[in-house]
Interface confidence: medium
Amino acid sequence: GSTVPPMVNVTRSEASEGNITVTCRASSFYPRNIILTWRQDGVSLSHDTQQWGDVLPDGNGTYQTWVATRICRGEEQRFTCYMEHSGNHSTHPVPSGNSHHHHHHHH
């Protein structure tokens, strides 16, 4: 089938005191090959500080996956979710504390 770019959604949730968990979800993309990773100061975090979900079919002929990491509250601006799919890439910030969702349909 033709390429379908992912919808990327970044959320944050409270973790332990002084920390938050940030999650980057990519959904509704095809084909299934995708790079999704958290970056600090623009550089990818080590694998052992990130958790990945499997790339799973979402029932519509497209796929979904996610990556999460724990960061210090107040350092959000240093972190971005990097997505690369079918030769295109995009970078997605952590939403500020009073806005918990950030959607971006990548073209």
Partner: antibody
Framework: QGQMQQSGAELVKPGASVKLSCKTS????????ISWLKQKPGQSLEWIAW????????SYNQKFRDKAQLTVDTSSRTAYMQLSSLTTEDSAIYYC???????????????WGRGTLVTVSA | DVLMTQTPLSLPVSLGDQASISCRSS???????????LEWYLQKPGQSPKLLIY???NRFSGVPDRFSGSGSGTDFTLKISRVEAEDLGVYYC?????????FGGGTKVEIK
Amino acid sequence: QGQMQQSGAELVKPGASVKLSCKTSGFTFSDNYISWLKQKPGQSLEWIAWIYAGTGGSSYNQKFRDKAQLTVDTSSRTAYMQLSSLTTEDSAIYYCARHDYYGTSGAWFAYWGRGTLVTVSA
Amino acid sequence: DVLMTQTPLSLPVSLGDQASISCRSSQHIVHSNENTYLEWYLQKPGQSPKLLIYKVSNRFSGVPDRFSGSGSGTDFTLKISRVEAEDLGVYYCFQGSHVPWTFGGGTKVEIK
């Protein structure tokens, strides 16, 4: 690769402030990290700070935290650096440079502006 | 801060010679993500620096293959296999693994 066009030379008095600009074209501005660097005549380079154009988030070399302030204007695709309380020690060429973090490259200062000469003199 | 020490300060060469520049860091410059962000830049007189090598040994786009980088830990080397006139200038090593990111003092490559 795109262009990084920096503002012209500045002659300023001690104690004053100056705002340098770096106007970009030819790439997706909001996807990029832009750093500012300092070079005194005949000397090496110092990294001042970076700013992520997508959010305005930034990280500073502690040495320059009270000296430099970075901002971006996404509508004009321009990065700015304001230098305050200038002394003769701040006389230097200041460069903006774009990081290249796509894929697995991880290259810091891949594309540079031509630099802005700042001279601090009474 | 990580101190980057380059040797020699000045390197007189004849065109066609091989040139070698050393860069030593005051501590290991392996990033927490296990990459080593050691880069080399060339600055010609009156120009902005240009990126030559990133991540120790990767040539940036458009950089001739006569430039090569190597090393690990705290010791790194830039080699130019056959120096051409356009290679003359000041070479800087740089580490981007630990904030604040820092440059070496520079090595001036000039005609003997």
